[in-house]
């Protein structure tokens, strides 16, 4: 018995070949012997039953001369899953058609971090098929009648080519995923005290009609609890602020991409924030973490100090050096100082290996006098 796979709504071609490779009389029937269609010697396709009943069934007249008499079933339905019989040259060929339906839960448009379940349904009691989906960038996910893709990323968006294999027979179908998310899961901004701070939250997708609301919660390093800094609404590309804290006095861009400006970096603002965006008609929220590290260099009496506040990695090195000279002091700590610094331009550096994250300069005029 030959097996043919078909996806609901698409077409399937059931094969029937003559041994003599020439036109001959043939008939396609259901397993209960009801006639579907055939050719009785005049080269004319004869349909069984009423036209409306069999309008989805056809054959390839162009292939008859070569001894091929396929049964084409269009707009496949789940109930088409059954055995079909081709009668020709005093023999019967049985062809088993397995029609499957693909469902995507919760859908093919998802938020970053969500999971997708792809399910194959069928009327027939077939043994477990192999389902495999491959992204154009090479990622492969496989399963049987159920295929799961968890913790989806923005880069999982786009076209996936899927194959269903059963008894070495294959059927292809495609799915286009749209995973909505921010371009970066997290970002870190390094600023000297007093500098203006800009936070950007670009989305990694473009949707013409985008409706939702968002909020930025901030956990300052110096504070015991987090605080809502700003809430906003989003409609298409239009951003409107609903509520903003008085300290700091944030400003938000009125159109996408989401963008916030903090007038100046101060030690009390150093810390980390979480921007959440809830989109209409989507369960769950999008998140982006943002971190602010603030540096201050000061000279008080005979002490030159450099401090950083905010979430720094243990690998980061803080150094104080006189310009064009070796570092006077370097530590994996958040504060370094030099007693009785000599006159000149001093540099405070925050670095990760040989990569300088930020630097602040302070002019020491003479012992105990400074100018930043």
């Amino acid at each position: 018995k030959t097996l043919v796979l078909g996806k609901e709504g698409e077409s399937a071609e059931l094969p029937c070949e003559s041994s003599q490779k020439k036109i001959t009389v043939f008939t396609w029937k259901f397993s209960d012997q009801r006639k579907i269609l055939g050719q009785h010697g005049k080269g004319v396709l004869i349909r069984g039953g009423s036209p409306s009943q069999f309008d989805r069934f056809d054959s390839k007249k162009g292939a008859w001369e070569k001894g091929s008499f396929p049964l084409i079933i269009n707009k496949l339905k789940m109930e088409d899953s059954q055995t079909y019989i081709c009668e020709l040259e005093n023999r019967k060929e049985e062809v088993e058609l397995w029609v499957f339906k693909v469902t995507f839960s919760p859908g093919t448009s998802l938020l970053q971090g969500q999971s997708l379940t792809l399910t194959l349904d069928s009327n027939s009691k077939v043994s477990n098929p192999l389902t495999e989906c491959k992204h154009k960038k090479g990622k492969v996910v496989s399963g049987s009648k159920v295929l799961s893709m968890s913790n989806l990323r923005v880069q999982d968006s786009d076209f996936w080519n899927c194959t269903v294999t059963l008894d070495q027979k294959k059927n292809w179908f495609g799915m286009t995923l749209s995973v909505l998310g921010f371009q970066k899961a997290s970002s870190i901004v390094y600023k000297k005290e007093g500098e203006q701070v800009e936070f950007s939250f670009p989305l990694a997708f473009t949707v013409e009609k985008l409706t939702g609301s968002g909020e930025l919660w901030w956990q300052a390093e110096r504070a015991s609890s987090s605080k809502s800094w700003i809430t906003f609404d989003l409609k298409n590309k239009e951003v409107s602020v609903k509520r903003v804290t008085q300290d700091p006095k944030l400003q938000m861009g009125k159109k996408l991409p989401l963008h916030l400006t903090l007038p100046q970096a101060l030690p009390q603002y150093a810390g980390s924030g979480n921007l959440t965006l809830a989109l209409e008609a989507k369960t769950g929220k999008l998140h982006q973490e943002v971190n602010l590290v603030v540096m201050r260099a000061t000279q008080l009496q005979k002490n030159l100090t450099c401090e950083v506040w905010g979430p720094t990695s243990p690998k980061l090195m803080l150094s104080l050096k006189l310009e064009n000279k070796e570092a006077k002091v370097s530590k994996r700590e958040k504060a370094v100082w030099v007693l009785n610094p000599e006159a000149g331009m001093w540099q405070c550096l925050l670095s990760d290996g040989d990569k300088v994250k930020m630097d602040s300069r302070i002019q020491v005029l003479s012992r105990g006098v400074n100018q930043t």
């Epitope: 203006q196 800009e198 609404d233 409609k235 298409n236 590309k237 239009e238 409107s240 400003q251 938000m252 861009g253 009125k254 159109k255 963008h259 400006t261 007038p263």
Partner: antibody, heavy 118, light 107 residues
Framework: EVQLLESGGGLVQPGGSLRLSCSAS????????MSWVRQAPGKGLDWVSS????????YHADSVKGRFTISRDNSKNTLYLQMSSLRDEDTAVYYC???????????WGKGTTVTVSS | AIQMTQSPSSLSASVGDRVTITCRAS??????LGWYQQKPGKAPKFLIS???SLQSGVPSRFSGSGYGTDFTLTISSLQPEDFATYYC?????????FGQGTKVEIK
Amino acid sequence: EVQLLESGGGLVQPGGSLRLSCSASGFTFSDYVMSWVRQAPGKGLDWVSSISGLTGNTYHADSVKGRFTISRDNSKNTLYLQMSSLRDEDTAVYYCAKDNEDYYMDVWGKGTTVTVSS
Amino acid sequence: AIQMTQSPSSLSASVGDRVTITCRASQGIRNDLGWYQQKPGKAPKFLISAASSLQSGVPSRFSGSGYGTDFTLTISSLQPEDFATYYCLQDYTYPRTFGQGTKVEIK
């Protein structure tokens, strides 16, 4: 063709009120942000107020807050500016402007003149 | 509110000259900046959006650049019809604010 036509300007005494209208045609009025911008004689452009078509949110310059109210009637394709407690410094040509899809004022009316004087 | 400082306030130039007008924002506004041209007794005309994107129908001798706080409008070869007043507008946030204008006059 997109067209904006302002009306309602005139002479008014300090402390008085006036309502400006802007009739729009040639585009789907309800989809766009609409604004009022003014220009005092011999001076530069001064943004007054904006209203979103999508959300209905309104925004006003500090100098007119509490005195001027922007509104719109999408069924009539008309933008309004209700001005009260008028001052000498409100004397200007008032332009109606339409935002484009990127939220820039791309099309402007010819303006209507408001004179506040006793 | 964000302040927009335009310079120079006026300039005299001849036909064929290259003219540059600058606009500085009191805080970062990304590239959310527009440029407008206004002739006496007329409504402003929209020239450039997003700091550098020329509007359709605007001659290619006009160009814009900048990001953050510093922006420039350049007219590569001044034509007689370009004598007018030019305004920058920050469109980053409300309240929208214009520069005070630059009047380009015939030398």
